[in-house]
Amino acid sequence: GSQHIRAEKAMVDGSWLDLAKRSKLEAQPFAHLTINATDIPSGSHKVSLSSWYHDRGWAKISNMTFSNGKLIVNQDGFYYLYANICFRHHETSGDLATEYLQLMVYVTKTSIKIPSSHTLMKGGSTKYWSGNSEFHFYSINVGGFFKLRSGEEISIEVSNPSLLDPDQDATYFGAFKVRDID
Amino acid sequence: GSQHIRAEKAMVDGSWLDLAKRSKLEAQPFAHLTINATDIPSGSHKVSLSSWYHDRGWAKISNMTFSNGKLIVNQDGFYYLYANICFRHHETSGDLATEYLQLMVYVTKTSIKIPSSHTLMKGGSTKYWSGNSEFHFYSINVGGFFKLRSGEEISIEVSNPSLLDPDQDATYFGAFKVRDID
Amino acid sequence: GSQHIRAEKAMVDGSWLDLAKRSKLEAQPFAHLTINATDIPSGSHKVSLSSWYHDRGWAKISNMTFSNGKLIVNQDGFYYLYANICFRHHETSGDLATEYLQLMVYVTKTSIKIPSSHTLMKGGSTKYWSGNSEFHFYSINVGGFFKLRSGEEISIEVSNPSLLDPDQDATYFGAFKVRDID
């Protein structure tokens, strides 16, 4: 009898431990992706950034997928999404085509099932980068809490991609799951 | 028999309650540190800010340590780190040496074991603050998700520290643990 | 005996499942509120924004309340609060009253028990929006980790509300609970 009880108890403990571990670890996907500057498109209009690192330096990913320039959600949930985008120009890089710049970021969500793309967050500034200064810099930060479904994709669009700061501490985006959908 | 079973059950319940409480409370260190403006250094380039409040007003800390101007990690995990830095100048504060300012923040991680310092996040802007305006203001916000190990230290570096806004709602940084390292 | 043990075990499992579900779901209130531009006040001084969506598009709320333009906390805890505020002006909207603008956001906490209002976070920038440009844009992002008590209210104040960008991806604020108060 007593041996049987202990076995039952062990089963309770064991199954609970599994459940606790599983719910804790699996319920918390995350990603922090840093810019891959070897493949930044040119131009000044809105451009989708498709080259990001996911496994070097500060970049990392777990229970999410990075594919074709997009961060793919594998698990339904509410996520905190964020992006930090830095732009810079030094006079040694040559003259800007225009001193009046629109430096913007758009964090977009694409649903495969219903082929559509929507902007979740945007930020930025119009800037006057005069030739009187040898160096110009500007950073944008956006963040917000969103419901994401498995299969949905997050991507980043920016204006003036040629001005992006290629450092991993400068231009990055990410997500982490905060809670399940009820 | 029945009494013994109830004792076993109580033990299961008790140990689980302990485990649940422990994992919930201990697994979530956090800090929100606000600037201590009584001791702001001078300089223009990267200057480390070492004076922060951790226990007054909005400032608070739990399961992390603040020492020698650095936020010390006591528990391995993935943390969301953030900083908000405000710069301001009023004509009554005196005359700036230059109108062309580089207002920047760098959130750095130092590892004691391998004595090295790395920038996790940076943000800011170059600004033209002319004497023709009586007041100037600019804020930077950065945030990101990082793996931190026990013993690692987070610190804040800024340019132009003499221009920092000393309010607790203006200049602060913080961290909170989101999940364990698998 | 054995039947009784199984009943006890089921009770352990059941109560634990309830506890796990309850602590997980109830312990995580959140809100993401987007600007309701049909009712934006005018003026250039600090104005409280009272019209926000909570149940359309990206806007959502759970275990918190939105009432009288304020986000009301229903559950004690430590929350991450954030706001993203975009300002914009196009020459087709007419001339600005002044080219020198102070574009600011203040995230405030009001306690009903002790009738007082305090600013938790502020951000923004002074801007020179010259008539030489046809379009101007600027975004502010702030975020931080705060202890909130049931009944406390979070609200948003901005300067120059007539310049707010009315898009749901542009002007929003939110909160999500990270952990209990010990």
Epitope: - | S44, D95, L96, A97, E99, Y100, Y128, S130, N160, S162 | -
Partner: nanobody
Framework: EVQLVESGGGSVQPGGSLRLSCAAS????????MGWFRQAPGKEREFVSA????????YYVDSVKGRFTISRDNAESTVYLQMNSLKPEDTAVYYC????????????????????WGQGTQVTVSS
């Protein structure tokens, strides 16, 4: 290497005026904060006035406030010090100085903050 050359000094009666000039060459003058110092015989070098990179901020030591005006012409790479209502105690050698990496407030400046110096020009105020 930046060269600074002062001119415009001379002798004047109390209450008179002088305009000092400092011409810069060999550097990016439009990125320097500029200042004027003076040294009277047997005394320490004294900070007189300074001007910001863009010329929109100026600083004056109390003893010259309201009498001296500092200005600059970045196109001509020149900084000026207009001295009115001169007094005998203004007698000194006046030096022009440039700071290539300006920061903070002009009021906090000391001689050690300046990277480049001119040779000086003599100003004598006596009746």
């Amino acid at each position: 290497e930046v060269q600074l050359v002062e001119s415009g000094g001379g002798s004047v009666q109390p209450g008179g005026s002088l305009r000092l000039s400092c011409a810069a060459s060999g550097g990016t003058f439009s990125r320097y904060a500029m200042g004027w110092f003076r040294q009277a015989p047997g005394k320490e070098r004294e900070f007189v006035s300074a001007i910001s990179v863009g010329g929109t901020y100026q600083y004056y030591v109390d003893s010259v406030k309201g009498r001296f005006t500092i200005s600059r012409d970045n196109a001509e790479s020149t900084v000026y010090l207009q001295m009115n209502s001169l007094k005998p105690e203004d007698t000194a050698v006046y030096y022009c100085a440039g700071d290539a990496s300006p920061y903070g407030y002009l009021r906090e400046y000391t001689a050690t903050r300046f990277d480049y110096w001119g040779q000086g020009t003599q100003v004598t105020v006596s009746s």
